[in-house]
């Protein structure tokens, strides 16, 4: 596995324990809470990131309108089951043997059952919406330039293919930010949009989980770009499976 | 060459606490896990936890989280093992182990707990 | 946690047969498994890591294979010394864990 070889550290992932016992005495970084081996070359997936800090001592409008089965992360932290590979399982349980059903980026996508409950696979996350609103500023933003400088970022530092960044779309103070990738589409090597998502809004909260770096500086044509809200809907190759009570609550 | 050496045999009662020691020498002491492992009279090898010398970094098996406690001094390249709450079934011989790559390379000579009233 | 499963518990043969040990996970681990030799009164020795790479000083007959979730331990010709109880172990995450072990013992 890949490591800044001078001191063994992970450079995108500092939620880690990194020493020189890897093949050849080569740097192997594992991460905290699951002890899984990461590729410090690339980003960690989602489930190990949210392990690891589940151990740590915690209409004509441009806008889009999420569709009726977009999902928003409620339930907040749990500690996930991860598979070999480092995804989340299908299946989630808690210690009160109350499990649910997890999208690609972990979020409930079922009511809560008991153990019985089954998901049968692990539905993917194939479109993603960043809502983002920022502080006042004197003017608006460019919309070329925010769009620009938004895809640069998503390439730059998080190493998102640029096909995956669909659509940048601006309303002062409304910035969305739309990632689509099917499974069709995801090449081995390709880093996921659930992942790129889960990193940029460690970004935005000032929670950065690359090693070393500087937090997050966003300028567009040198003016900061600070978020004050953020809202990432989630929508699923299968529709989500809820009781007709959770829809009308 | 790399040596691990732990402390001698203990004899203790049920309800007390053991501490374990084992001094590494022949390789940088802090780039290294250090792992333990029990092995109870006729059984198989049970890992209990490793702890990481340059940070302290520690993760227990579940199945001991509350009562074993792993520490280090890097001064004497020493790291210990407590277990506290003893009782019948801990009897055992307890190893430190290096790890490298994927296996345990490096063994101490064990250490022999024996829980008794 | 990864569940390891030996198999046959005891294996009896003589010596210059072959052995054929196995370790199933119940999970996919790739290749992070080792293998031990364990005898009376000692440490156990490290013999095989990342399931087929063999450990310098440790005799050409001890070999290693699989991948994903079934592993092999093959002794090509049992020497006297072989005789002696071998365990298979996992490092893909914590915690780790060893499997029930296989006794090699003289027919």
């Known amino acids: 596995h890949t490591a800044a070889q001078d001191n063994c550290t992970c450079p995108t992932n500092k939620m880690t324990v990194c020493s020189p016992d890897g093949p050849g005495g080569r740097c192997q970084c594992r991460a905290l809470g699951s002890g899984m081996a990461v590729d410090c070359s690339t980003l960690t997936s989602k489930c190990l990131l949210l392990k690891a800090r589940m151990s740590a001592p915690k209409n004509a409008r441009t806008l889009v309108r999420p569709s009726e089965h977009a999902l928003v992360d409620n339930d907040g932290l749990y500690d996930p089951d991860c598979d070999p590979e480092g995804r989340f399982k299908a299946r989630q349980c808690n210690q009160t043997s109350v499990c649910w059903c997890v999208n690609s980026v972990g979020v409930r996508r079922t009511d809560k059952g008991d153990l019985s409950l089954r998901c049968d696979e692990l539905v993917r996350t194939h479109h993603i919406l960043i809502d983002l609103r920022h502080r006042p500023t004197a003017g608006a933003f460019n919309h070329s330039d925010l769009d620009a400088e938004l895809r640069r970022l998503f390439r730059e530092r998080y190493r998102l293919h640029p096909k995956f960044v669909a659509a940048v779309h601006y309303e002062q103070p409304t910035i969305q930010i739309e990632l689509r990738q099917n499974t069709s589409q995801k090449a081995a090597g390709d880093v996921d949009i659930g992942d790129a998502a889960y990193y940029f809004e460690r970004d935005i909260k000032g929670e950065s989980l690359f090693q070393g770096r500087g937090g997050l500086d966003l300028r567009v044509r040198g003016e900061p770009l600070q978020v004050e809200r953020t809202l990432i809907y989630y929508l699923d190759e299968i529709p989500p499976k809820f009781s007709m009570k959770r829809l009308t609550a | 060459e790399v040596q691990l050496v732990q402390s001698g045999a203990e004899v203790k009662k049920p309800g007390a606490s053991v501490k374990v020691s084992c001094k590494a020498s022949g390789y940088t002491f802090t780039s290294y896990w250090i792992n333990w492992v029990r092995q109870a009279p006729g059984q198989g090898l049970e890992w209990m936890g490793n702890i990481y010398p340059s940070n302290s970094y520690t993760n227990y098996n579940q199945k001991f989280k509350d009562r074993v406690t792993m520490t280090r001094d890097t001064s004497t390249s020493t790291v210990y093992m407590e277990l506290s709450s003893l009782r019948s079934e801990d009897t055992a011989v307890y190893y430190c182990?290096?790890?490298?790559?994927?296996?345990?390379?490096?063994w101490g000579q064990g250490t022999l707990v024996t829980v008794s009233s | 946690e990864i569940v390891l499963t030996q198999s046959p518990a005891t294996l009896s043969l003589s010596p210059g047969e072959r052995a054929t040990l196995s370790c199933r996970a119940s999970q996919n681990i790739g290749t992070s498994i080792a293998w031990y030799q364990q005898k009376p009164g000692q440490a156990p020795r490290l013999l095989i890591e990342f399931a087929s790479e063999s450990i310098s000083g440790i005799p050409a007959r001890f070999s290693g294979s699989g991948s994903g979730t079934d592993f092999t331990l093959t002794i090509s010709s049992l020497e006297p010394e072989d005789f002696a109880v071998y365990y298979c172990?996992?490092?893909?995450?914590?915690?780790?864990?060893f499997g029930g072990g296989t006794k090699v013992e003289i027919k």
């Open positions: 172990q996992q490092s893909n995450s914590w915690p780790f864990t």
């Open positions: 182990s290096s790890y490298r790559s994927e296996g345990f390379a490096y």
